[in-house]
């Protein structure tokens, strides 16, 4: 038998259980927490990854100013409800019957309410701004080299189509990556920008979701690019609905 047959694992998601019980002894993998079958040739949805994480044992180069409607994920981890395709359900509730509406990346976009709260549709996050600060280096990175390497990273590692990386901005030491993907642009089989951003965020934190014990090795012209701070802003196709009380808090 071949070495590949020995290695029944999921390259794109280490939070899976895999066995060679697919057709013709093919390797088949299911996500922890949900038990859903996953396609290991592409990224697993953020919803299924969060569910798996919660089930695991506890252990011009001007910078963009996020719009007034940009959301930041301040709520952190929760055990989400995912639909049969692995996407976030529009309404999420916790064990104490507190409910809220989320966008396609699972970030809360309304005030919290009770079980009577209605979330009519899953609102798409169509613009993600990833704001990074890199560790000090001997000199600034060359902007075009940095731009090319980050675009290549998203294409090769996260399998994100290049057209969805809208821009890479750089003013040392701040790097901003803009991802844009409207509902009409996303074809079947395209990686979602929300999933790519989540994998990138986990990589930057040293918590790679890819198979094995390794992590992200990102270099620009051989010089390691090490990030010391990350902020991610999410912009939805429909602005979020928060009460004024929250906005003035």
């Amino acid at each position: 038998h071949t070495a590949a047959q020995d290695n029944c694992t999921c390259p794109t998601n280490k939070m899976t259980v895999c066995s060679p019980d697919g057709p013709g002894g093919r390797c088949q993998c299911r996500a922890l927490g949900s038990g859903m079958a996953v396609d290991c040739s592409t990224l697993t949805s953020k919803c299924l990854l969060l569910k798996a994480r919660m089930s695991a044992p506890k252990n011009a180069r001007t910078l963009v100013r996020p719009s007034e409607h940009a959301l930041v994920d301040n709520d952190g981890l929760y055990d989400p409800d995912c639909d049969p395709e692995g996407r976030f359900k529009a309404r999420q509730c916790n064990q104490t019957s507190v409910c809220w509406c989320v966008n396609s990346v699972g970030v809360r976009r309304t005030d919290k309410g009770d079980l009577s709260l209605r979330c009519d549709e899953l609102v798409r996050t169509h613009h993600i701004l990833i704001d990074l600060r890199h560790r000090p280096t001997a000199g600034a990175f060359n902007h075009s080299d940095l731009d090319a390497e980050l675009r290549r990273l998203f294409r090769e590692r996260y399998r994100l189509h290049p057209k969805f990386v809208a821009a890479v901005h750089y003013e040392q030491p701040t790097i901003q990556i803009e991802l844009r993907q409207n509902t009409s642009q996303k074809a079947a089989g395209d990686v979602d920008i929300g999933d790519a951003a989540y994998y990138f965020e986990r990589d930057i934190k040293g918590e790679s979701l890819f198979q094995g014990r390794g992590g992200l090795d990102l270099r620009v012209r051989g010089e390691p690019l090490q990030v010391e701070r990350t902020l991610i802003y999410y912009l939805d196709e429909i602005p979020p609905k928060f009460s004024m009380k929250r906005l003035t808090a």
């Epitope: 020995d6 090769e156 590692r157 390794g214 051989g222």
Partner: nanobody, 125 residues
């Protein structure tokens, strides 16, 4: 679809040399850690050597240190394993492996996602 194709195996006498090659047909080659693994008859898979994308880091199993040398040519999408002072215990099927792009890797097979079909190396007099 990444395809790794090994070549260079064969029959060699103890003390002799062989050079294995592995061509990666994928476009992501230059950002992958590449490795060589082997399986001796009746044994499990053993990590032999690994090289980083830029060739600046290499790892070797204790059993092959100072005898085997791994190298890569990113212009040719090829990784090599130069094997000198070969011993009968080096007899095995040798496999080339590639990590997921931009993913660090060690001599652990779990760190690798793509595999070749193997090339047989026989060391015998």
């Amino acid at each position: 679809e990444v395809q790794l194709l090994e070549s260079g195996g064969g029959l060699v006498q103890p003390g002799g040399s062989l050079r294995l090659s592995c061509v990666d047909s994928g476009s992501t080659y230059s950002r992958r850690y590449m490795g060589w693994f082997r399986r001796a008859p009746g044994k499990g898979l053993e990590g032999v050597s690994v090289i980083s994308p830029y060739g600046d880091s290499t790892y070797y199993a204790d059993s092959v240190k100072d005898r085997f040398t791994i190298s890569r040519d990113n212009a040719k999408n090829t990784v090599y394993l130069q094997m000198n002072s070969l011993k009968p215990e080096d007899t095995a099927m040798y496999y080339c492996a590639a990590s997921w792009p931009y993913q660090t890797a060690s001599l652990d097979a779990m760190d690798f996602t793509d595999w070749g079909q193997g090339t047989l190396v026989t060391v015998s007099s």
